[in-house]
């Protein structure tokens, strides 16, 4: 991954914080939030982008070359944006305009554009589709996707908070 210009860390921090809140509002669980079940081999099996140790999102990795980590976050944002665009969220029960889900979708797009302003070719991604006999699964899939997104955004927000605190270019005073 080539080293390129750094993002606006402070703006990314603000947007990612807002996204965390929106994801929570879109699906606030009953009771306490527990951690996702994850297994090491699930990454390759399901092609679900997760921020892992080797992605360079730790403080040292960000300092050395933040592009590795940012690329991972970009992939995750694109993945979840595609899911929010899929039949799972577009079908019944319909989502209301300006609902937390719609706001979440808009903000995901906003952060993606902030990280990736130029037009990159989209990776082809297999979207889950439900047969007529599987329509009952839609609410469960929405819940699982939003729970997974909440976990992803929580880590991304920590990355941007660290970047904003330590990697932001200091302002040069003018004479």
């Amino acid at each position: 991954v080539p080293r390129s210009s750094s993002p606006d860390w402070a703006q990314c921090q603000q947007l990612s914080r807002n996204l965390c809140m929106l994801a929570w509002n879109a699906h606030a669980p009953a009771g306490h939030m527990n951690l996702l079940r994850e297994e090491e081999d699930e990454e390759t099996k399901n092609n679900v982008p997760r921020i892992q140790c080797e992605d360079g999102c730790d403080p040292q990795g960000l300092k050395d070359n933040s592009q590795f980590c940012l690329q991972r976050i970009r992939q995750g944002l694109a993945f979840y944006k595609h899911l929010l665009d899929s039949d799972i969220f577009k079908g019944e029960p319909a989502l209301l305009p300006d609902s937390p889900m719609e706001q979440l979708h808009t903000s995901l797009l906003g952060l993606s554009q902030l990280l990736q302003p130029e037009d990159h070719p989209r990776e082809t991604q297999q979207m889950p589709s439900l047969s007529s006999s599987q329509q009952w699964q839609r609410p469960l899939l929405r819940s699982k996707i939003l729970r997974s997104l909440q976990a992803f955004l929580a880590i991304a927000a920590r990355v941007f908070a660290h970047g904003a605190a330590t990697l932001t270019e200091p302002l040069v005073p003018t004479a």
């Epitope: 669980p29 079940r37 699930e42 889950p128 699964q137 469960l140 699982k144």
Partner: nanobody, 122 residues
């Protein structure tokens, strides 16, 4: 892997009620979406109701909407199916199942209980 044991089935008259329970062990119960399915004699196993990991999202088959209610108690590792206004056509073996998929983009009820018989007489 999670083990599931159903209870609460029995013989009831049409219009009556039953409450099924499904006790889970051997897994992180609060991580799993849970579902109830049923199989009538000579028929395929059909979806009845399901609930997400936290209990905030539920979904039902059209045939039981308004009559059945699924709920869960994560502290007790148990999922329930409250069945009211029972009809003879609700007669079946009722199975509890856990979504064993770690992926957010699939549902896989891969772990099943042994079932409990519900018979509704007219």
């Amino acid at each position: 892997e999670v083990q599931l044991v159903e209870s609460g089935g029995g013989l009831v008259q049409a219009g009556g009620s039953l409450r099924l329970s499904c006790a889970a062990s051997g897994g992180t119960f609060s991580s799993y979406a849970m579902g109830w399915f049923r199989q009538a004699p000579g028929k395929e196993r059909d979806f009845v109701a399901a609930i997400d990991w936290s209990g905030s999202t539920t979904t039902y088959a059209d045939s039981v909407k308004g009559r059945f209610t699924i709920s869960r108690d994560n502290a007790k590792n148990t999922v329930y199916l409250q069945m009211n206004s029972l009809k003879p056509e609700d007669t079946a073996v009722y199975y509890c199942a856990a979504d064993m998929s770690h992926s957010p983009i699939e549902i896989d009820f891969g772990s099943w209980g042994q079932g409990t018989q519900v018979t509704v007489s007219s």
